[in-house]
Interface confidence: low
């Protein structure tokens, strides 16, 4: 009878193990062992028992002892069982980002690891377990559906195996997979408000506010803001789940005509783009031209105002006739003229909308200088020893310079506050003299002597 | 309604003269400039003649010493005397104006066009 020490086996991939082989019977003819595995025989005293130190053992394996004895041949096998841990644990590579909403399939697939029937695989979230299943085929695969919620953002998801030989007087050897960072994301299918001017003139800024709601997480938000090839530079401020993206844009006479905007906003793999029309227009304002800024009275004055030729100008409220860039007045100029503002209103039709500019020029009118009985009374009676004061007012563009005298020497104080007294009375020459000429008036001051009863 | 009416074109042979008219008439208070522009089969238009109202005239280089502008006033009419005329001067002739209309509010200047008369300078 032969017998074999150890029976069964479980060792390490690549591990030695001495085997034992033993026969009943004491001379036997032949005592040996069948493996495929390098051995090397131990010497020991007697005949009946052999031992071999079988090395290098990569899988699972049968050697057999043998022995011839009088009674006849036996044999008895011992069962070697390799364990190793996997080769591969791993998670098949997934998106990072993953819309919230989405079924996520997480797959693990694990290469090698013995025994089979002593390997779990683990699906795992965090550490809370998905699913736990044999590992069976090679490579072995495990799969799970998850429905991506919003509180799964930043989770950890990892595949792990357990190769659990603790049965068998072995420990718990587990391998785990580099971890999946699930990053979810909400992106409405609403596309971005996009609020710009429509028409933009050349040398100005305008500012282009982009704006969404309903993003989650907001912070991981990307805007890009684009007039044309121009990337626009946007501030922006982010509230719990919307953005809001303002940007400065500045246009020169280049970008003259219609320009694209773009504001496309990118979260995990998917973007949302809004387009939008803006025409950049160059329209200087009107031109006011006047003869001459500073006429004479009665002198004729043309005011022409001119446009951007496809624009339509009115001048004082008339349109031009016909209607277009350019409208002309004509006038004798008169003091009331004087200060006069002519405005031109231009208007040019950009994309739609009616743009607006204006010009002013103001015309100066000189005339006088003027003295009359209105602003300069001829004759004054004032009781002796009152206080008055004596008012003459001369007019003229430039102010005229006024000087009341008598007998070319005593001046009457106009615009003072005097005591009539008799040397006042008299007749005064008043003179007002400008850079226009002069004007004289005379003035008659009399002094009512009090009555003495 | 303003209306520039031109007149006095015609066939002529090289060398010979012509002389245009062009009289504006409607709600007119005055007329600044006045002037003639020409056009010839598939050219851009160009100016001719030029004449303020106060008589200043400025010329085409091509027509200097052969045409002469001059204005009546009163009539509010233009006249293109055109002497020594050569086949490149064909072409329909345009008179133009900045006339002065009288409005509620004031006055307003149009530039105005007639209808052009035809001058071929043919042997």
């Known amino acids: 009878q032969t017998s074999v020490s150890p029976s069964k086996v479980i060792l390490p991939r690549g591990g030695s193990v001495l085997v034992t082989c033993s026969t009943s019977c004491d001379q036997p003819k032949l005592l040996g062992i069948e493996t495929p595995l390098p051995k090397k025989e131990l010497l020991l005293p007697g005949n009946n028992r052999k031992v071999y130190e079988l090395s290098n053992v990569q899988e699972d394996s049968q050697p057999m002892c043998y022995s011839n004895c009088p009674d006849g041949q036996s044999t008895a096998k011992t069962f070697l069982t390799v364990y190793w841990t996997p080769e591969r644990v791993e998670l098949a590579p997934l998106p990072s980002w993953q819309p919230v909403g989405k079924n996520l399939t997480l797959r693990c697939q694990v290469e090698g690891g013995a025994p089979r029937a002593n390997l779990t695989v683990v699906l795992l979230r965090g550490e809370k377990e998905l699913k736990r299943e044999p590992a069976v085929g090679e490579p072995a695969e495990v799969t799970t559906t998850v429905l991506v919620r919003r509180d799964h953002h930043g989770a950890n998801f990892s595949c792990r195996t357990e190769l659990d030989l603790r049965p068998q007087g072995l420990e718990l050897f587990e391998n785990t997979s580099a971890p999946y960072q699930l990053q979810t994301f909400v992106l409405p299918a609403t596309p971005p408000q996009l609020v710009s001017p429509r028409v933009l003139e050349v040398d100005t800024q305008g500012t282009v506010v982009c704006s969404l709601d309903g993003l989650f997480p907001v912070s991981e938000a990307q805007v890009h803001l684009a007039l044309g090839d121009q990337r626009l530079n946007p501030t922006v401020t982010y509230g719990n789940d919307s953005f809001s993206a303002k940007a400065s844009v500045s246009v020169t006479a280049e970008d003259e005509g219609t320009q694209r905007l773009t504001c496309a906003v990118i979260l995990g793999n998917q973007s949302q783009e809004t387009l939008q029309t803006v025409t950049i227009y160059s329209f200087p304002a009107p031109n006011v031209i006047l003869t001459k800024p500073e006429v004479s009275e009665g002198t004729e004055v043309t005011v022409k105002c001119e446009a951007h030729p496809r624009a339509k100008v009115t001048l004082n409220g008339v349109p031009a006739q016909p209607l277009g860039p350019r409208a002309q007045l004509l006038l004798k100029a008169t003091p009331e003229d004087n200060g006069r503002s002519f405005s031109c209103s231009a208007t040019l039709e950009v994309a739609g909308q009616l743009i607006h500019k204006n010009q002013t020029r103001e015309l100066r009118v000189l005339y006088g200088p003027r003295l009359d009985e209105r602003d300069c009374p001829g004759n004054w009676t004032w009781p002796e020893n009152s206080q008055q004061t004596p008012m003459c007012q001369a007019w003229g563009n430039p102010l005229p310079e006024l000087k009341c005298l008598k007998d070319g020497t005593f001046p009457l104080p106009i615009g003072e506050s005097v005591t009539v007294t008799r040397d006042l009375e008299g007749t005064y020459l008043c003179r007002a003299r400008s850079t226009q000429g002069e004007v004289t008036r005379k003035v008659t001051v009399n002094v009512l002597s009090p009555r003495y009863e | 309604q303003v209306k520039l009416e031109e007149s006095g074109g015609g066939l002529v042979q090289p060398g010979g003269s012509l002389r245009l008219s062009c009289a504006a008439s409607?709600?007119?208070?005055?007329?600044?400039?006045m002037g003639w522009y020409r056009q010839a089969p598939g050219k851009q238009r160009e100016l001719v003649a030029r004449?303020?109202?106060?008589?200043?005239?400025a010329y085409e280089d091509s027509v200097k010493g052969r045409f002469t502008i001059s204005r009546d006033n009163a009539p509010n009419t233009v006249f293109l005397q055109m002497n020594g005329l050569k086949p490149e001067d064909t072409a329909v002739y345009y008179c133009?104006?900045?006339?002065?209309?009288?409005?509620?509010?004031?006055?307003?200047?149009?530039?105005?066009w007639g209808q052009g008369t035809q001058v071929t300078v043919s042997s």
């Open positions: 004449i303020t109202r106060d008589g200043s005239a």
């Open positions: 409607g709600s007119i208070f005055s007329i600044n400039d």
């Open positions: 133009n104006a900045e006339i002065i209309t009288t409005q509620t509010l004031g006055r307003m200047l149009g530039e105005y």
